[in-house]
């Protein structure tokens, strides 16, 4: 069946060293356990995280994300997932694309991550 993929229409903000959470869902909501779900960096198409055949495909990740991502899957049966990026770096800032693939049918949604310096302070004077 057909569906749409929905991501945040606003930038997700995270501090360097903290976690970033990038939510994504399909509409109308349906069980996505059997689907392929993933995130890649746009426009470079580097794999950030991939879930296929009911498992995270760690070997397919770009090296700079290896060991730093987690797919929150507790609500995948409702078509809702979140990518958590740990120990956020300045280089993580930019565009991401989330996709859901059901057999040959695929839809995706773009989103943006803004990374901020927790120690940056502007003198109000």
């Amino acid at each position: 069946g057909q569906f749409r993929v929905i991501g945040p229409g606003y930038p997700i903000r995270a501090l360097v060293g903290d976690e970033a959470e990038l939510p994504c869902r399909i509409s109308p909501g349906k069980n996505a356990t059997g689907m392929e779900v993933g995130w890649y960096r746009s426009p470079f198409s580097r794999v950030v995280h991939l879930y296929r055949n009911g498992k995270d495909q760690d070997a397919e990740q770009a090296p700079e994300y290896r060991g730093r991502t987690e797919l929150l899957k507790e609500t995948i049966s409702e078509g809702k997932v979140t990518l958590r990026i740990q120990n956020v770096r300045f280089s993580d800032e930019g565009g991401y694309t989330c996709f859901f693939r059901d057999h040959s049918y695929q839809e995706e949604a773009a989103m943006e991550l803004k990374v901020e310096d927790p120690f940056y302070w502007v003198n109000p004077g």
């Epitope: 929905i6 606003y10 903290d18 959470e21 939510p23």
Partner: antibody, heavy 119, light 107 residues
Framework: QVQLVESGGGLVQPGGSLRLSCAAS????????MNWVRQAPGKGLEWVSA????????YYADSVKGRFTISRDNSKNTLYLQMNSLRAEDTAVYYC????????????WGQGTLVTVSS | DIQLTQSPSSLSASVGDRVTITCRAS??????LAWYQQKPGKAPKLLIY???SLESGVPSRFSGSGSGTDFTLTISSLQPEDFATYYC?????????FGQGTKVDIK
């Protein structure tokens, strides 16, 4: 089943403070963003504040920015709203509501708690 | 901030009538719009999400349409329990604003 129960409302003088709580049950609390929405007597709904599932991101309406603080304790499945420098115009029923990641509608709401700011 | 303007602000109708409420966004919000029903003294109840998807358990007489800036909630045949206030809400970006509401009462 999903349940959201607000508490902490009451009568407070202008300039005073109050902390609202919202106890959640029946779902994986840490996976959901949470919101506070208020409704002044006889008026419409006004979104007040939101917090991400991890608590790392917070958002506020301009009308409460700098005065209200949203927080959550995922170990206690509880959402909070610390309200300082209260004004008469903050008088309202305050509802907590859940959504998924800030990208979904509010599918479950609490019953509301009344905050009255008056001298 | 995105403003939502509902029209009409109130309407009188009879049981069996077809009722249409519109919601206009001040800028495009794709399909990130929901409709809620609220009865006096109660919390709002989600009816429609993503502009046109019917929430589970909501009667099929409720339907939604639209995308971008113009949205519509339709009640195909008004029932006695449908007399209430209806709100639209956008969740495309923060702040997640609501429309001012449309009160549907008995003619």
């Amino acid at each position: 089943q999903v349940q959201l129960v607000e508490s902490g409302g009451g009568l407070v003088q202008p300039g005073g403070s109050l902390r609202l709580s919202c106890a959640a049950s029946g779902f994986a609390f840490r996976n959901y963003a949470m919101n506070w929405v208020r409704q002044a007597p006889g008026k419409g709904l006004e979104w007040v504040s939101a917090i991400s599932g991890s608590g790392g991101s917070t958002y506020y309406a301009d009308s409460v920015k700098g005065r209200f603080t949203i927080s959550r304790d995922n170990s206690k499945n509880t959402l909070y709203l610390q309200m300082n420098s209260l004004r008469a115009e903050d008088t309202a029923v305050y509802y907590c509501a859940r959504d998924y990641g800030g990208i979904s509608p509010f599918d479950y709401w609490g019953q509301g708690t009344l905050v009255t700011v008056s001298s | 901030d995105i403003q939502l303007t509902q029209s009409p602000s109130s309407l009188s109708a009879s049981v069996g009538d077809r009722v249409t409420i519109t919601c206009r966004a001040s800028q495009g919000i794709s399909s990130a719009l929901a409709w809620y029903q609220q009865k006096p003294g109660k919390a709002p109840k989600l009816l429609i999400y993503d502009a046109s998807s019917l929430e589970s358990g909501v009667p099929s007489r409720f339907s939604g349409s639209g995308s971008g800036t113009d949205f519509t909630l339709t009640i195909s045949s008004l029932q006695p329990e449908d007399f209430a206030t209806y709100y639209c809400q956008q969740f495309n970006s923060y702040p997640h604003t609501f429309g001012q509401g449309t009160k549907v009462d008995i003619k």
